[in-house]
Interface confidence: medium
């Protein structure tokens, strides 16, 4: 399964929207910075598209879940958020189409499960942080920047997979 070129463009649009969503300068929020422990190795270790697609799908699904909460709607610009949902939804569809075609179904299921679990735990840490910080503007800004960084890293992985073929 080849992810369409539009998927790559969609990833870039998603990053652009995340950048546009920024409301305050993180310089104002230095004390709120937090290391969420992005499981980068779970992306770096998956050398085959078969192993990667379910992990990427989980990543995007979790981003969608995080930004579609009531607290998120209150924090961000509604128009940008709607565009953001649309881009994420399209990417989920692209990845699901690949899974349906049989990619990622048979190979190393345990390895994939561990990776998916690591991604879920990463987002649990983010959710807990937001709760502890009472969904403050700085907490949301820290999370937005973190998601942008981790999404960018996973996007780079997609690109490197495409270039390997």
């Amino acid at each position: 399964c080849d992810l369409p070129q539009t998927h790559s463009l969609g990833s870039r649009r998603t990053l652009m929207l995340l950048a546009q969503m920024r409301k305050i300068s993180l310089f104002s929020c230095l004390k709120d910075r937090h290391d969420f422990g992005f499981p980068q190795e779970e992306f770096g270790n998956q050398f085959q598209k078969a192993e990667t697609i379910p992990v990427l799908h989980e990543m995007i699904q979790q981003i969608f879940n995080l930004f579609s909460t009531k607290d998120s709607s209150a924090a961000w610009d509604e128009t940008l958020l709607d565009k953001f949902y649309t881009e994420l939804y399209q990417q989920l569809n692209d990845l699901e189409a690949c899974v349906i075609q049989g990619v990622g179904v048979t190979e190393t299921p345990l390895m994939k499960e561990d990776s998916i679990l690591a991604v879920r735990k990463y987002f649990q840490r983010i959710t807990l942080y937001l709760k502890e910080k009472k969904y403050s503007p700085c907490a949301w800004e820290v999370v937005r920047a973190e998601i942008m960084r981790s999404f960018s890293l996973s996007t780079n992985l997609q690109e490197s997979l495409r270039s390997k073929e």
Partner: antibody
Framework: QVQLVQSGAEVKKPGASVKVSCKAS????????ISWVRQAPGQGLEWMGW????????GYAQKFQGRVTMTRDTSTSTVYMELSSLRSEDTAVYYC?????????????????WGQGTLVTVSS | DIQMTQSPSSLSASVGDRVTITCRAS??????LNWYQQKPGKAPKLLIY???SLESGVPSRFSGSGSGTDFTLTISSLQPEDFATYYC?????????FGGGTKVEIK
Amino acid sequence: QVQLVQSGAEVKKPGASVKVSCKASGGTFSSYAISWVRQAPGQGLEWMGWMDANNGNTGYAQKFQGRVTMTRDTSTSTVYMELSSLRSEDTAVYYCARSLFPTIFGVEVAFDIWGQGTLVTVSS
Amino acid sequence: DIQMTQSPSSLSASVGDRVTITCRASQSVSSYLNWYQQKPGKAPKLLIYKASSLESGVPSRFSGSGSGTDFTLTISSLQPEDFATYYCQQSSSTPLSFGGGTKVEIK
């Protein structure tokens, strides 16, 4: 490769103001935060404040609050630092410095690119 | 405000020596600690960020370690071009602050 080019040396009288410019070339200007750091002759480094080149937000060290103003001109990719009510202790080399990562990715407040420095001498 | 204290303030060493500079923060700065090198008449140059991450283009003989309040910059084998002044800087909270500097001189 991004470069920060600062304006030339200045000699000022006590009580006057000085405005130092820092022009970015060869890269995306608005994605980064710019800080100003000064160094008195034979002394260490002292952080004065920052400006987010994207939206113009600023933050100043308490010590300089009320005396320092940082502004930007996006059309020329230039950031300015104005220091007023100058006194002899303000004699120093003033540096502008760029944050290591784009502010959209968060702030790792390390400075990877520096201007060449502007010597400001305050003397009667 | 967080105070940064470097030691020693100066040291003499020979080419090939292993050099260690320490930096202590008046309160925890987590791993938000950077190291710079400055030569006379020049702007500082970033060596290490976030306590131990080597800035691109910086030789691997430079390394950083530590977290909380105590940090170390190590030069594993001093080279002629390493004679300079070294500063630590905390980026845990504003106002950002620098250590007083450590001048590394030729023995």
